[in-house]
């Protein structure tokens, strides 16, 4: 499992399916993004690879998901962090890891935290270490709202399609 | 809470409800499986007990969920692990705990990891210990796709209906 | 991120949107509650503030969500706990942290655990500490069912709209 995700060749094979009609339903806005594994010190979301997709109006701009239609959406994200033994040098103070989904809306001119998870890791005490964070919830969103993420501990991310992702779907 | 889940007699009483129509909607494929608590060294999914169910085409075969209709599904799973120290204050190797939801599809002949969570636990350091992992996301699936799980640390699973589960529903 | 959530004045501005029609859909029951940050030693759910809402029949009574219509619902909750060490590197008893979503139904006269997450924290070893728990799953519920939560470690909750929440929506 640590080597999660697909090899480059497998990733080519496993491109997202062509747009499909939802089981027993008309299409509804949905998106699933994965963290770009080629960018090691940033978290850039990608929609055109592996299992990722944008459907029925969702778009990705400036690393944010743009909400296509007003309504209630389930929004979710996961990150996995890892580290090596004794990677800290002259400290035993904990490493602060956090992941947040934020909303930027025309209604108020600042980023509102929607989902936040946090962890302190003591790398000198626990070597090597791995930690996963997941969260998701339903929110009333307005057309044009921007959903983005903020992460503390980006250099420690385990970037693969199954470990670091961000998505939303209309209910 | 450690004694989560129902007693055997209560489980009899609490069998899943008869199939019900979804609030304000036609039925859509949905499934919720629980880990069989009678199997201590394996993770066998069950649909015919407690709060578990299979609805509108989902089926369980070879410990995998079979996708009934092409479309976008939200897929989720949780595990809870627990353990005791090997020996008080003893130095021990870390225990690698991981849980993954995998896709096996006719489109490519290998298991693709969809959702992965991982953790290192240092039992000698922290005794007793408990750890929960949850993940879920939206995926484009094709009729006949097989959803399964792979778990590292199965002997440490806390098998009850509310702690170890696996499910999916069409959006 | 620890200072997540809105300031009181911003919270006024950011009250939930007026009831909106779901993208491409008729309304369906949905609810998202947040932990009341003014109550430090209890977990009281609120629906009339920040991003929280009750829609299409959901109501909040005696700190429980009342299910408005029989059907399948996705139910979810998150908590974040934090604390400081009793004394640096001191050996201390573990702190048991747990969060559970429970169902009380007319069908059987006791609380059934639906979702449970648990953690042992060793404050003397790890100071300060932070831990997040999330879970969610699909359940067949009946009109009048009551969904509530039980938490061990309430004094350690990080009460903000983005860290402690509880919700459900009809599929």
């Amino acid at each position: 499992l640590p080597g999660v995700g697909l090899t480059p060749s497998a990733a080519q094979t496993a491109r997202q399916h062509p747009k499909m009609h939802l089981a027993h339903s008309t299409l509804k806005p949905a998106a699933h993004l994965i963290g770009d594994p080629s960018k090691q010190n940033s978290l850039l979301w990608r929609a055109n690879t592996d299992r990722a997709f944008l459907q029925d109006g969702f778009s990705l701009s400036n690393n944010s998901l743009l909400v296509p239609t007003s309504g209630i959406y389930f929004v979710y994200s996961q990150v996995v962090f890892s580290g090596k033994a004794y990677s800290p040098k002259a400290t035993s103070s904990p490493l602060y890891l956090a992941h947040e989904v934020q909303l930027f809306s025309s209604q108020y001119p600042f980023h509102v935290p929607l989902l936040s998870s946090q962890k302190m890791v003591y790398p000198g005490l626990q070597e090597p270490w791995l930690h996963s964070m997941y969260h998701g919830a339903a929110f009333q969103l307005t057309q044009g709202d921007q959903l983005s993420t903020h992460t503390d501990g980006i250099p420690h991310l385990v970037l693969s399609p199954s470990t670091v992702f961000f998505g939303a779907f209309a209910l | 809470l450690p004694g989560v889940g129902l007693t055997p007699s209560a489980a009899q009483t609490a069998r899943q409800h008869p199939k019900m129509h979804l609030a304000h909607s036609t039925l859509k494929p949905a499934a919720h499986l629980i880990g069989d608590p009678s199997k201590q060294n394996s993770l066998l999914w069950r649909a015919n007990t407690d709060r578990a169910f299979l609805q509108d085409g989902f089926s369980l075969s070879n410990n995998s969920l079979l996708v009934p209709t092409s479309g976008i599904y939200f897929v989720y799973s949780q595990v809870v692990f627990s353990g005791k120290a090997y020996s008080p204050k003893a130095t021990s190797s870390p225990l690698y705990l991981a849980h993954e939801v995998q896709l096996f599809s006719s489109q490519y002949p290998f298991h693709v990891p969809l959702l992965s969570s991982q953790k290192m636990v240092y039992p000698g350091l922290q005794e007793p210990w408990l750890h929960s992992m949850y993940h879920g996301a939206a995926f484009q699936l094709t009729q006949g796709d097989q959803l399964s799980t792979h778990t590292d640390g199965i002997p440490h699973l806390v098998l009850s209906p509310s702690t170890v589960f696996f499910g999916a529903f069409a959006l | 991120l620890p200072g997540v959530g809105l300031t009181p004045s911003a919270a006024q501005t950011a009250r939930q949107h007026p009831k909106m029609h779901l993208a491409h859909s008729t309304l369906k029951p949905a609810a998202h509650l947040i932990g009341d940050p003014s109550k430090q030693n209890s977990l009281l759910w609120r629906a009339n503030t920040d991003r929280a809402f009750l829609q299409d029949g959901f109501s909040l009574s005696n700190n429980s969500l009342l299910v408005p219509t029989s059907g399948i619902y996705f139910v979810y909750s998150q908590v974040v706990f934090s604390g400081k060490a009793y004394s640096p590197k001191a050996t201390s008893s573990p702190l048991y942290l747990a969060h559970e979503v429970q169902l009380f139904s007319s069908q059987y006269p006791f609380h059934v655990p639906l979702l449970s997450s648990q953690k042992m924290v060793y404050p003397g070893l790890q100071e300060p500490w932070l831990h997040s728990m999330y879970h969610g799953a699909a359940f067949q519920l009946t009109q009048g069912d009551q969904l509530s939560t039980h938490t061990d470690g309430i004094p350690h909750l990080v009460l903000s709209p983005s860290t402690v929440f509880f919700g459900a929506f009809a599929l």
């Epitope: 800290p88 002259a90 904990p94 250099p155 | 130095t91 | 991120l1």
Partner: antibody, heavy 114, light 113 residues
Amino acid sequence: EVQLVESGGGLVQPGGSLRLSCAASGYTFSSYWIEWVRQAPGKGLEWVGEISPGSGSTNYNEEFKGRATFSADNSKNTAYLQMNSLRAEDTAVYYCADGYHGYWGQGTLVTVSS
Amino acid sequence: DIQMTQSPSSLSASVGDRVTITCKSSQSLLYSTNQANFLAWYQQKPGKAPKLLIYWASTRDSGVPSRFSGSGSGTDFTLTISSLQPEDFATYYCQQYYSYPRTFGQGTKVEIK
């Protein structure tokens, strides 16, 4: 290239206050604690305390509690040390450091004198 | 607080000499679970910031010459310079990061004989 750059030092009157800045660049700032260490002229090193910029958590040397306050602005990748009720014996070079990676700034001299 | 005591407080040596500096802590810095000693060694030259040499008692920082080595466990630690070079004349400090407050030794000044 990783750099920690302190600023804000100078001459201060006894009883006065000052705010030192520590600007970090070349690495992600928020997850790693910034430590403050001072060194009086011709003396050894003394740990003042530390702050986790992302979480806002702090640890103070009891000798400085009440007179020292740590803060951080993640958007500016900068940590701050506010020192109040300064005395002559607070005259020192003040360093910020990231113990996780082993980086230290060049230091800034604070002189408390009338 | 953990007290850190270095000896000697100063020493005179020649280029090529083997130099040993000791550091004693008032309580053990060994964390038994992972057998790690929470001790670092720094080098400081006049007018400059301290430079990390050794961490976890015996791990050399990147770029630090191999003539520097750290040893010891529990309460007794040693910094050794196997063959003193002209650029090594400086003051050396040990520091514990086992508990708060972090504390330093009083320093050992290595001077040219």
